[in-house]
């Protein structure tokens, strides 16, 4: 190109359809210059113009020769250029923001613009750059790219941005530009110019404000607070902690709190102070709702479903910010809501859902929601399998007969379609409790009835009941306890009887024991005693309870004594005992010793004993007839342990074993014994019968049985030199080697001569008795031997 000719040809396009080509005019040319522009490829087109630019339709691929001829007053000049698409720049039109708005409550900016895609024929990707600036000084706070696609028509685009600083704190500006990325265009692609700026600012409705107000945020987040003020802010505090001030426009300030801690239930207090005033706000830092845990749905009554759950981690948000729960049943579409001020505990929450007719299977979703998020749990239940019955109420007991009662109770709910399994607890006083299970059909009217048999007459029972459904889920709580005394029945057995002849042998004394409650079947009022022989039967007058003894004058003939117990309902079967005693000449008195609590008696099996055995016992020191108690044992027994609360250690008892045959009793064994032996309580009395120069003869007396306290096994006789009332050691003091001891095991021996003594010497003598229970106390005496003659 010659100097002074058109130069610097540049072509740009904003839509790939039209190229806008411009050049610089030759130096020295002014207005009034005309240009002829010719474009030549296979054909040639020329255009006459009066300006230094031309709009031409986009040229197809390949090189084009452009000739620009400038015609001016002092001649003409021509320039030639080679042009193809690679020399063309694609620069989009400057975009325009249609709308910039703000939601101050969430500190969010909303941006809206048009991509003007209708002027662009080709599908292309567009990159938008969005710039957010803050404060009058327009500090850049956000630069973001946003991708869209041009699709041949005008499209509105939206972008939103949540500011880390409340929008009220400072003016915010937004501008945008774009860049078109077209795969088919081989030229240069460049950014558009920035759009005209738009801004958002808050018009204060009062002198001073703190932002945000009542904001709910996630624990661990960062948050910015600001104070929009006309007066100088001196300090900012979160709780009692000072925070550094960030200066904004004018007197406005901000503070940034990083990694905020969980708030107390009331929130966290933030204050800004000025010379004259104080301004505050509250932030609530908490957690989104945890997934509801242990979600469980059950019913008490098949009318209402109770769904309960544990809320899990505490959100630290209460009141209007607390978690609200919605229980949705998906088959029916029905739902119920729970809104509660959350207490800072993990107690169980619950919701009630009315059961729907003819629906047994429920698909529940529990949705939890608070300002920080939501969560859910689901459960699918067949509600007939999840019945947790109410506690049975109005529990009553009525008699049917002496061994059966009728139990009735109330169990609210419509259970017509299911069966109950109820557990009845039956407790007799002083006895183990019994459990009985009954299956009963559920009813609509809530009233239930069951009969209970196999009870004992005249027995105080305590009943209680609990129920579950047959497809077990949970037992109900136990009903209240009900005490009930069954009615009386005739005594089931006659009294346990025994007889003794009086000491003069003329009267027969009949003894009987009170019937145990389970045989008395009621309160025993009286006893009938009768006496019969082959010739006659004689009845005594009725003997009122609690007398358990009767005396009849009898000769030595055979009589059968009958004892019958009577209560308000009737009489027991008679207890019969023969007056006759079968003699036994072959009797030795044996010794027996017990085992601390009782005494074991054994005997050989005797096939002749056809009725039973009786063991009777008494205190040896008691006068005749000797009877403390008796025990009957079956005829096939060969041993029994006799125990009695009246047995005492160290007391001698007589035991008699009787066998019964042909309705008569024969004494088989006679024993004396102790349930436990003790040491004698006294020492034997002894005297010196004779003294010589080298010997002493000692004689002693028996210890009375009561003071022996066991079977006497022997005596211990100690002797050694010793004088009365001197400091010389006594016989039983330890360490004496000159003391001699004689153990006398022949308990019939009552004298002892001690020989080989020294003459005219004082001896200390000691005598002690012993049993298997121990050695008794000592009796001592001082004796001086005679002088040697």
């Amino acid at each position: 190109q010659k100097k002074g000719a058109p130069h610097d040809l540049k072509c740009v396009t904003n839509n790939l359809q039209v190229w806008n080509c411009s050049w610089k005019a030759p130096s020295g040319t002014g207005r009034g210059t005309d240009y002829e522009v010719c474009i030549e490829n296979r054909s040639r087109s020329c255009y006459q113009l009066e300006k230094t630019s031309i709009k031409i339709p986009a040229l197809s691929h390949g090189d084009y020769e452009i000739t620009i001829n400038s015609l001016h007053d002092f001649g003409s000049s021509t320039s030639k250029f080679t042009l193809n698409e690679q020399n063309v720049s694609l620069i989009p039109d400057t975009p325009e923001i249609l709308n910039l708005s703000a939601d101050f409550s969430t500190s969010t900016l909303y941006l809206k613009w048009n991509d003007r895609g209708s002027v662009f024929p080709h599908r292309s990707n567009v990159i938008w750059e969005i710039k957010v600036l803050r404060k009058e000084s327009m500090e850049l706070v956000k630069l973001v790219t946003h991708n869209t696609t041009l699709n041949g028509k005008d499209t509105l685009h939206h972008w939103s941005w949540a500011s880390d600083m409340p929008l009220e704190c400072a003016i915010h500006f937004v501008e945008i530009r774009c860049y078109i990325d077209n795969l088919h265009f081989s030229g240069l692609e460049e950014w558009s110019d920035w759009s005209p700026v738009k801004n958002i600012s808050w018009i204060p409705d009062s002198q001073t404000k703190v932002f945000p107000q009542d904001k709910v945020i996630l624990v661990g987040s960062d948050i910015t607070f600001c104070c929009v003020s006309q007066e100088k802010v001196l300090s900012a505090l979160i709780g009692h902690t000072n925070c550094p001030l960030i200066h904004l426009d004018g007197e406005n300030v901000a503070i940034k709190i990083r990694n905020i801690s969980v708030s107390a239930s009331s929130g966290t207090n933030v204050v800004f102070t000025t010379e004259d005033n104080i301004f505050g706000t509250v932030i609530f830092a908490g957690y989104p709702p945890d997934t509801p845990q242990q979600l469980n749905c059950e019913t008490h009554d098949l009318k209402e479903i109770i769904c309960s759950w544990n809320p899990g981690r505490v959100t630290a948000l209460v009141g209007p910010r607390a978690t609200s729960y919605t229980l949705v049943e998906s088959f029916s579409g029905k739902y119920v809501r729970l809104k509660r001020a959350e207490a800072p505990t993990n107690e169980s929450y619950q919701l009630l859902f009315q059961m729907l007719p003819n629906q047994e299977i429920y698909n529940f979703t529990l949705n939890a929601h608070n300002p920080l998020g939501r969560s859910q749990s689901t459960i699918l239940v067949n509600i007939t399998e999840k019945v947790y019955p109410h506690t049975p109420t109005s529990f009553k007991v009525k008699d049917i007969n002496s061994t059966a009662v009728k139990l009735s109770w109330h169990l609210p709910g419509n259970f017509a379609k299911i069966n109950f399994l109820c557990e009845i607890e039956i407790k007799k006083s002083n006895s183990v409790q019994e459990q009985r299970n009954v299956t009963i059909k559920g009813v609509e009217n809530s009233s239930y009835l069951v009969a209970l048999d196999k009870l004992n007459p005249y027995t105080l029972y305590t009943f209680r009941i609990r129920c579950s459904t047959e497809t077990f889920w949970k037992w109900s709580k136990w009903s209240n306890k009900k005490q009930h005394l069954t009615t009386e029945a005739s005594p089931s057995k006659g009294p346990d009887t025994w007889r003794e002849w009086s000491s003069d042998g003329k009267n027969l004394i009949i003894y009987w024991k009170p019937l145990p409650i389970n045989e008395a079947n009621g309160k025993i009022l009286s006893y009938n005693v009768s006496c019969s022989s082959d010739e006659e039967t004689q009845s005594l007058s009725e003997i009122p309870d609690p007398q358990h003894k009767a005396e009849i004058r009898l000769d030595k003939n055979d009589y059968i004594i009958s004892v019958v117990a009577k209560n308000s309902v009737g009489s027991s079967p008679p207890s019969k005992i023969a007056s006759m005693e079968i003699p036994n000449d072959d009797l030795k008195i044996e010794q027996v010793v017990g085992m601390g609590k009782g005494i074991l008696l054994t005997w050989h099996y005797d096939p002749n004993m056809t009725c039973d055995y009786v063991i009777k016992w008494c205190n040896s020191s008691r006068s005749e007839p000797c009877l403390m108690d008796w025990r009957k044992v079956p005829s096939n027994s060969t041993e029994t342990v006799i125990e009695s609360d009246e047995f005492r250690p160290g007391i001698r008892y007589n035991f008699f074993l009787y066998g019964c045959r042909n309705q008569g009793y024969q004494l088989l064994r006679s024993m004396i014994g102790y349930i436990e032996e003790l040491a004698p309580i006294v020492a034997p009395n002894f005297t010196v019968e004779d003294t010589s120069a080298d010997s002493i003869l000692v004689k002693w007396e028996d210890i009375p049985v009561e003071e022996l306290r066991g079977f006497l096994r022997g005596y211990l006789f100690y002797f050694g030199k010793g004088e009365r009332d001197t400091s010389k050691m006594r016989v039983l003091e330890s360490g004496r080697s000159d003391i001699k001891v004689k153990n006398i095991t022949d308990i019939s021996q009552k004298t002892l001569r001690i020989a080989d003594l020294q003459g005219k010497t004082s001896y200390h003598l000691v005598l002690r008795a012993y049993t298997d229970g121990g050695v008794g106390p000592e009796k001592s005496m001082y004796v001086v031997t005679k002088e040697n003659s």
Partner: antibody, heavy 123, light 108 residues
Framework: QVQLVESGGGVVQPGRSLRLSCAAS????????MHWVRQAPGKGLEWVAV????????YYEDSVKGRFTISRDNSKNTLYLQMNSLRAEDTAVYYC????????????????WGQGTLVTVSS | EIVLTQSPGPLSLSPGERATLSCRAS???????LAWYQQKPGQAPRLLIY???SRATGIPDRFSGSGSGTDFTLTISRLEPEDFAVYYC?????????FGPGTKVGIK
């Protein structure tokens, strides 16, 4: 139990001064922000001033700024209100009130009040 | 300053009736900073509700508070004879801490 007892009220001429005291007991005085609130005869409540628990900050109602001074002596468990340049419109029952101890809040409502002391400004 | 207005004016009700008292702020008040007090003749005020809805210690549950922004309410579900008094709302979120003019609840 918490007790607040005001004293120092009386009749005073316009332009004169008066000092009110509030004796506190039954709580840790030094942990609580304290306020003065007044009530003109037959009228509503009007907040007068606040002093922080440690005495570091004091704030006043506009009409008393520059005339009234709130102070406290934590060693004596006592709150004071020095009232200078008294005006007829300052006539009221003056209550001292304790802030509710609300975690570590510096802005709280008033949970305990004294029975009040009457200040009459009259010539 | 934040100006609080209370309505209605004097309220005449019978024991057992429900009382609804309103408090309106001239500008938005954080719900954390609104309290209600009760005052009987010759007595000091007593704190009933703080933080819009939290009952103070010893206050019976027939007293409840609600509201947000500029509108707040105190509700007495069933008036007892001892509830007839003057009720004040107060904001304590920015100084000066202002009280409403009060609503008198009298016996009909």
């Amino acid at each position: 139990q918490v007790q607040l007892v005001e004293s120092g009220g009386g009749v005073v001429q316009p332009g004169r001064s008066l000092r009110l005291s509030c004796a506190a007991s039954g709580f840790t005085f030094s942990s609580y922000g304290m306020h003065w609130v007044r009530q003109a005869p037959g009228k509503g409540l009007e907040w007068v001033a606040v002093i922080w628990y440690d005495g570091s900050n004091k704030y006043y109602e506009d009409s008393v700024k520059g005339r009234f001074t709130i102070s406290r002596d934590n060693s004596k468990n006592t709150l004071y209100l020095q009232m200078n340049s008294l005006r007829a419109e300052d006539t009221a029952v003056y209550y001292c009130a304790r802030e509710l101890r609300y975690f570590d809040w510096l802005l709280s409502p008033f949970d305990y009040w004294g029975q009040g002391t009457l200040v009459t400004v009259s010539s | 300053e934040i100006v609080l207005t209370q309505s209605p004016g004097p309220l005449s009700l019978s024991p057992g009736e429900r009382a609804t008292l309103s408090c309106r702020a001239s500008q938005s008040v954080s719900s954390s900073f609104l309290a209600w007090y009760q005052q009987k003749p010759g007595q000091a005020p007593r704190l009933l509700i703080y933080g819009t809805s939290s009952r103070a210690t010893g206050i019976p549950d027939r007293f409840s508070g609600s509201g947000s922004g500029t509108d707040f309410t105190l509700t007495i579900s069933r008036l007892e004879p001892e509830d007839f008094a003057v009720y004040y709302c107060q904001q304590y979120g920015s100084s000066p801490f202002t009280f409403g003019p009060g609503t008198k609840v009298g016996i009909k």
